[in-house]
């Protein structure tokens, strides 16, 4: 089975860890695919290791474990993420995560704390 946090949130400009946990007494993981909606983020294979899709190579870092660290988040990154575990002999298992990217606290609080009285 696949166990994951179904809903997570992170701040714009920040980073988030996308993690699925696969548990089985008999099946072994041979490959894990990560997608943002329909778009490939990265693939891990026991034979070949990690490959991050070139579209995301500057923002996606493999790990920890079989998860991904997604950096420099934008509001457009809000949406569904899917992990697909290919296992032998168990077949294919899928997990879903919904990521909500929120405005950074600085934006929400305004810039008042950075304003100073004019000198003189």
């Amino acid at each position: 089975t696949i166990d994951t946090k179904r809903n997570i949130s992170a701040e714009e400009g920040g980073s988030v860890i996308l993690q699925c946990h696969f548990s089985s007494d008999t099946a072994e993981v041979t490959q894990v695919d990560w997608k943002q909606q329909d778009q490939l983020l990265a693939i891990y294979s026991v034979d070949l290791g990690w490959h991050v899709a070139s579209v995301f190579s500057d923002r996606v870092v493999p790990g920890p474990s079989l998860g991904l660290t997604f950096q420099s988040l934008t509001m457009n990154d809000t949406g569904e993420y899917f992990c697909t575990y290919h296992t032998y002999p168990g077949g294919i298992y899928k997990g879903r995560i919904f990521l909500k990217v929120q405005e950074s606290s600085d934006d929400r609080n305004g810039l008042a704390q950075f304003q100073t009285a004019p000198l003189g």
Epitope: K35, Q39, D47, H51
Partner: antibody
């Protein structure tokens, strides 16, 4: 540098047999799925067969099923295609190809021409 | 089997033109779509994998988009070395299938 070098093509009569080889170098051959793709003269690309990295699974196009056999020898870094009961419509350039993650073909051989004619 | 339909089958264009080639799958294939370039007498070469990822070493004037059933390959500014035949290919399920090809010729 990744290299895939096909050999074994040639002229054969209908009903005859040929065995194609593909010698791989420059990468860990045993880690990759490998495929055969063919191209008839002046035509498009047609997938023929594939084999998983550990040789556990093989797949074939309907047009060659029961006549062609894909195999590999990971100790020799070599991919094979045994072609039996050849037909005129099997005439084509045959390419061996490397397929990481069973997703895309990132390297192709230069191809070997198989001509089936009487 | 999944059918891949490419259009147009051929086109004439000039150096510097923006060229768009489309590929339609007979059923949803998510982003399991790859694009290849082939020149006469040569093996195909991977341009775009997973619908939108640029293969290492391929010029950035090539780009891919789409998901599900409809996909596009775009050459933003056609160069002399880009005159070739382009194929899409789905890897969603066996048998793997290719589009019929689009030949890009000099106008």
């Amino acid at each position: 540098e990744v290299q895939l070098l096909e050999s074994g093509g040639g002229l054969v009569q209908p009903g005859g047999s040929l065995r194609l080889s593909c010698a791989a170098s420059g990468f860990t051959f045993s880690s990759y799925s490998m495929h055969w793709v063919r191209q008839a003269p002046g035509k498009g690309l047609e997938w023929v067969a594939s084999i998983k990295s550990d040789t556990s699974s093989t797949y074939y196009a309907d047009s060659v099923k029961g006549r062609f056999t894909i195999s590999r020898d990971n100790s020799k870094n070599t991919l094979y295609l045994q072609m039996n009961s050849l037909r005129a419509e099997d005439t084509a350039v045959y390419y061996c190809a490397r397929v990481p993650y069973d997703y895309w073909i990132d390297y192709w051989g230069q191809g070997t021409l198989v001509t089936v004619s009487s | 089997d999944i059918q891949m339909t490419q259009s147009p089958s051929s086109l004439s264009a000039s150096v510097g033109d923006r060229v768009t080639i489309t590929c339609r799958a007979s059923q949803s294939i998510s982003s399991y779509l790859n694009w290849y370039q082939q020149k006469p007498g040569k093996a195909p070469k991977l341009l775009i994998y997973a619908a939108s990822s640029l293969q290492s070493g391929v010029p950035s004037r090539f780009s891919g988009s789409g998901s599900g059933t409809d996909f596009t390959l775009t050459i933003s500014s056609l160069q002399p070395e880009d005159f070739a035949t382009y194929y899409c290919q789905q890897s969603y399920s066996t048998p793997l299938t290719f589009g019929g090809g689009t030949k890009v010729e000099i106008k």
